[in-house]
Amino acid sequence: DPASKSRSCGEVRQIYGAKGFSLSDVPQAEISGEHLRICPQGYTCCTSEMEENLANRSHAELETALRDSSRVLQAMLATQLRSFDDHFQHLLNDSERTLQATFPGAFGELYTQNARAFRDLYSELRLYYRGANLHLEETLAEFWARLLERLFKQLHPQLLLPDDYLDCLGKQAEALRPFGEAPRELRLRATRAFVAARSFVQGLGVASDVVRKVAQVPLGPECSRAVMKLVYCAHCLGVPGARPCPDYCRNVLKGCLANQADLDAEWRNLLDSMVLITDKFWGTSGVESVIGSVHTWLAEAINALQDNRDTLTAKVIQGCGNPKVNPQGPGPEEKRRRGKLAPRERPPSGTLEKLVSEAKAQLRDVQDFWISLPGTLCSEKMALSTASDDRCWNGMARGRYLPEVMGDGLANQINNPEVEVDITKPDMTIRQQIMQLKIMTNRLRSAYNGNDVDFQDASDDGSGSGSGDGCLDDLCSRKVSRKSSSSRTPLTHALPGLSEQEGQKTS
């Protein structure tokens, strides 16, 4: 009945106006629809311009909905990252504060004369944790070498120790084990603990980064057409009350988000690996136990050096010759009191357990984020019909939606009736993000085995995939030691969402 409400375009007028468009475009009554390029060409309340405006609007609305969903996930990952990062940094800072508070009393000048070396060690550990491409074992070895050189001079102020003698001392050091078992123990435990902590936090950063970048991938023109048809063609065709059929909506969004769904497998792998590596946070080589107790290993090392002084000196003289005695120099340093050791195992504070259980639950919740996205957006954003009945909008008219729902991912869209998807042309941004997920998963798996992927031999088992250098966003820096000739810079990108802290000022 041309005189009925739906034929008069009143409802369309209301909806169109509410979206901020000019009402002068809207016909008073239905017109012939041969001009329509997206909606079925029956009688319509939409002009060409209206159709174009609504197509652009539906496209923007879907992109906004997509970004909103991504933002919620990003915010969760960023909160997790910040919480874990704060906790791990707090553990290390606590250890350094304890060292600064207790070592002067425990070791006197053996500490105060070497305060800078200890500060440097903590700075290097901090840099390593924050993603700097430095070799932790090498860093620790250099620290012990420098410390031995300095302490040996302090313990023998009566000896003239020129640089060549100190070089000889350095060469002897490994065989002499001047600091007892502490360096070896710290190396083994710290490597595992720091690798686990940093790779977990990096994993959160990479996941967040992937979500952010994927949310910026534009929806193609075929998707725009399909979404317009899904959301606004019912209005144009005079059935504005008809809500989209659920399966119809799913097919449209599965077509639109086909590339995003291809993230699913590697996304799950990453989250699984992250959940798995939290096992490494506990026990005697666990993150909390080790990172919070670096100072106790250092104390143990200095005590061992004092205990072994005479034997060590004899062996050094045997290997490097008799150093000249300075006639003006004082006698050998008196044996100092042993530095009292705090218990090596930090009692767990409970903070990390709480963080881990929350993280595990949240990571499990978002495991199927990419494949559930079409369903989520349909149910939350598209005002679907409550049932697949014959009263819902099926893209052509009110009625049942008959096609089957497509599978997930690009390959499964070959016969998608709603969106023309070229399955031979995957989105390159999303492929790159899949690669980033693979690289990070590979890092986490290596970290689980106690290895730092940045410094594994090229003669690895060949498994895994990725760029081969474990670097993200092509922001690699080079490893360095005093013996090599390159430079080292922190990879701030390794923890997206955290800016690199500047070097500390002290006075």
Epitope: D120, E124, R482, T506
Partner: antibody, heavy 119, light 108 residues
């Protein structure tokens, strides 16, 4: 061989800032601390502070702490010393100096940069 | 801060003679003392570290010694090129390294 090459002489007005650079070569840049020492005309040497090129950590002489900033660029093996709120008594030759080994002994020196502060 | 006091302010010695320069620390700096030589218009040059160890390439006529907080730089058989200002520096008190005010050595 170890070389430290500093930027050229500067003339500044009181209240301004100056940034002096020191480019290192001939050794592993990140392996040794770099220090800045200044010498006013006809005066002695005064230690201003140090930077660890590996970590960026800095330690400043209390006297300059509010006005000095030391930074480094590992990609170019260069350290920088910026002094702000200049006054006439900051007129001096500014030297960068590299430690001998991990010890606070200045074995290698730049050629010096004369900074003149004058209105 | 550790104050380093050098004496004399100026020392005038004939060539071939021995010059003895002194440096006193206001508190113990162990043997962590270095000596530098500075010629006009040049950067300082390291001579001695560890109070008595000669730096690489420094001739044997330069020697250092110490007793307690008193440090001495001795230049034997002086040559005209030894004319310079000599500074002592303590590096015991990190992070407050301090220099003496310098001794000007003139060759008569």
């Amino acid at each position: 061989q170890v070389q430290l090459v500093q930027s050229g002489a500067e003339v500044k007005k009181p209240g301004a800032s100056v940034k002096v650079s020191c480019k290192a070569s001939g050794y592993t840049f990140t392996g040794y601390y770099m220090h800045w020492v200044r010498q006013a005309p006809g005066q002695g040497l005064e230690w201003m502070g140090e930077i660890n090129p590996s970590t960026g950590d800095t330690t400043y002489n209390q006297k300059f702490k509010a006005r000095v900033t030391m930074t480094r660029d590992t990609s170019t093996s260069t350290v920088y010393m910026e002094l702000s709120s200049l006054r006439s008594e900051d007129t001096a030759v500014y030297y960068c100096a590299r430690e001998k080994r991990d010890d606070g002994v200045f074995a290698y020196w730049g050629q010096g940069t004369l900074v003149t502060v004058s209105s | 801060d550790v104050v380093m006091t050098q004496s004399p302010a100026t020392l005038s010695v004939p060539p071939g003679d021995r010059a003895t320069l002194s440096c006193r620390a206001s508190q113990s700096v162990s043997s962590r003392l270095a000596w530098y030589q500075q010629k006009p218009g040049q950067a300082p040059k390291l001579l001695i570290y560890g109070a008595s160890t000669r730096a690489t390439g420094i001739p044997a006529r330069f020697s250092g010694s110490w007793s307690g907080t008193e440090f001495t730089l001795t230049v034997s058989s002086l040559q005209s090129e030894d004319s310079a200002v000599y500074y002592c520096q303590q590096y015991n008190d990190w992070p407050r390294y301090t220099f003496g005010q310098g001794t000007k050595l003139e060759i008569k």
